[in-house]
């Protein structure tokens, strides 16, 4: 997260760290007791490593009573996701067992009504992604509030030049932005999950390259079918 600040500890009990061989790779969001939603491209970076999900964490390194690492029973990328595009960049991870819920571990309601968030709406994005252009990684969860950007502006040639489909949304990126390592994490508007950080190799913090988020409401049928 660029231009953000440390989150209040455990105030986002839905927040997950998708890890490979014990290292944070991507963000994720607990959407059901046994399911974490993330970004499909995160798996590509995992290679053949052991994928696990950390729940109940604020610090990645320090011991915390609520922290628990779960093995992944099943990884389900969206069937139409492709390595060369950010389309359908969603991944569902089934935990090896139901998560132990509590004040620091709780699923987040996700948007089912397929309607665009009003431009200008302030939404919260959180993650353990890099906090500087130099690539500094934080130990503790960071977050930032970002205004939603209308799709027409996001589709301008100097922005994303027509690449933003109706199944995506954008948020402003003027110094405050999601960045590398935040992919798969949640964009939360009004206490509801609206978007998932896409995992393209986008420049961060440049206002002409807004953050791109996969709209979960557009994938309600797929999410329901996997969770069923």
């Amino acid at each position: 997260i660029l231009g953000g600040r440390e989150a209040e500890a455990h105030a986002r009990p839905y927040m997950a760290s998708v890890q490979v061989n014990g290292e944070h790779l991507c963000g994720g969001v607990l959407v059901a007791e046994q399911w974490v939603l993330s970004a499909a491209h995160c798996l590509e970076d995992a290679a053949d490593g052991k994928v696990q999900v950390l729940l109940g964490a604020h610090s990645l390194s320090q011991p915390e009573p609520s922290k628990r690492l779960y093995d992944v029973l099943r990884a389900v990328p969206h069937p139409d996701s492709r390595p060369d595009t950010i389309d359908h960049d969603l991944l569902l991870l089934q935990l090896s067992e139901k998560a132990t819920l509590g004040p620091a571990v709780r699923p987040l309601p996700w948007q089912r009504v397929d309607r665009d968030v009003e431009p200008g709406t302030l939404c919260d994005v959180a993650g353990w992604g890099i906090v500087s252009h130099a690539g500094r990684r934080p130990d503790r969860l960071q977050h930032v509030l970002l205004p939603v950007l209308d799709r027409a502006t996001c589709n301008r040639r100097t922005h994303h030049d027509g690449a933003i489909t109706q199944r995506m949304m954008c948020a402003e990126s003027n110094r405050r932005d999601s960045c590398k390592g935040d992919s798969g994490g949640p964009l939360v508007c009004g206490g509801v999950l609206e978007g998932v950080v896409t995992s393209g190799s986008r420049v961060c913090g440049n206002r002409k390259k807004p953050g791109i988020y996969t709209r979960v409401a557009s994938y309600a049928a797929w999410i329901d079918s996997v969770l069923a």
Epitope: P119, D150, R151, A152, T153, N155, R156, R157, T158, H160, D161, G162, A163, I164, Q166, V203, N206, K208, K209
Partner: antibody, heavy 116, light 112 residues
Framework: EVHLQQSGPELVKPGASVKISCKAS????????KNWMRQRHGESLEWIGD????????NYNQKFKGKATLTVDKSSSTAYMELRSLTSEDSAVYYC?????????WGQGTLVTVSA | DVLMTQTPLSLPVSLGDQASISCRSS???????????LEWYLQKPGQSPNLLIY???NRFSGVPDRFSGSGSGTDFTLKISRVEAEDLGVYYC?????????FGGGTKLEIK
Amino acid sequence: EVHLQQSGPELVKPGASVKISCKASGYTFTDFYKNWMRQRHGESLEWIGDINPNNGGTNYNQKFKGKATLTVDKSSSTAYMELRSLTSEDSAVYYCAREGPSFAYWGQGTLVTVSA
Amino acid sequence: DVLMTQTPLSLPVSLGDQASISCRSSQTIVHSNGDTYLEWYLQKPGQSPNLLIYKVSNRFSGVPDRFSGSGSGTDFTLKISRVEAEDLGVYYCFQGSHVPPTFGGGTKLEIK
């Protein structure tokens, strides 16, 4: 399939105004800016301005400020350009184009002829 | 405004020949985001312009690979490796990095 259908040719008198339209189909109208260009006979293209169909926000080429006014009607997925105080210098073909990707999609053009 | 100067004004070619069109901008057209928004359009007689190349060297979908774009800073080139009859028309370069966006004066590709 993306399609931009412009209104037909106009013959107008000097000093009058004209409003030409550009109806979009094949995509969600509010997802892309609409741009307008002018091309005088045998000449190159000039950018007039653009409009964000979400909020009606506009940007104009300084050269066309006071000459052109851009508007949209979201309910009919139509962009409009009004040209006022017309002179023979304004006789040209006017194009609308969708921005994103680049100007990949253009209307067929509207010929405006200013003549007494 | 950024002035886009194209040369030549007219380019007579034989079918199967290579054609090269130059476009020079009056200032650098590298955008503040680091990208260069230099595009090439072909306008056939009585038609609207068609996008060929965007961001200097990227072919738009459906554009044959005989079209290629190159250049940087202020100097850009469009090459057609083997001219076909359907390639005839007026070629325009365009910059979208600075406001207002501007087009070159055009190069007419015609049969020798």
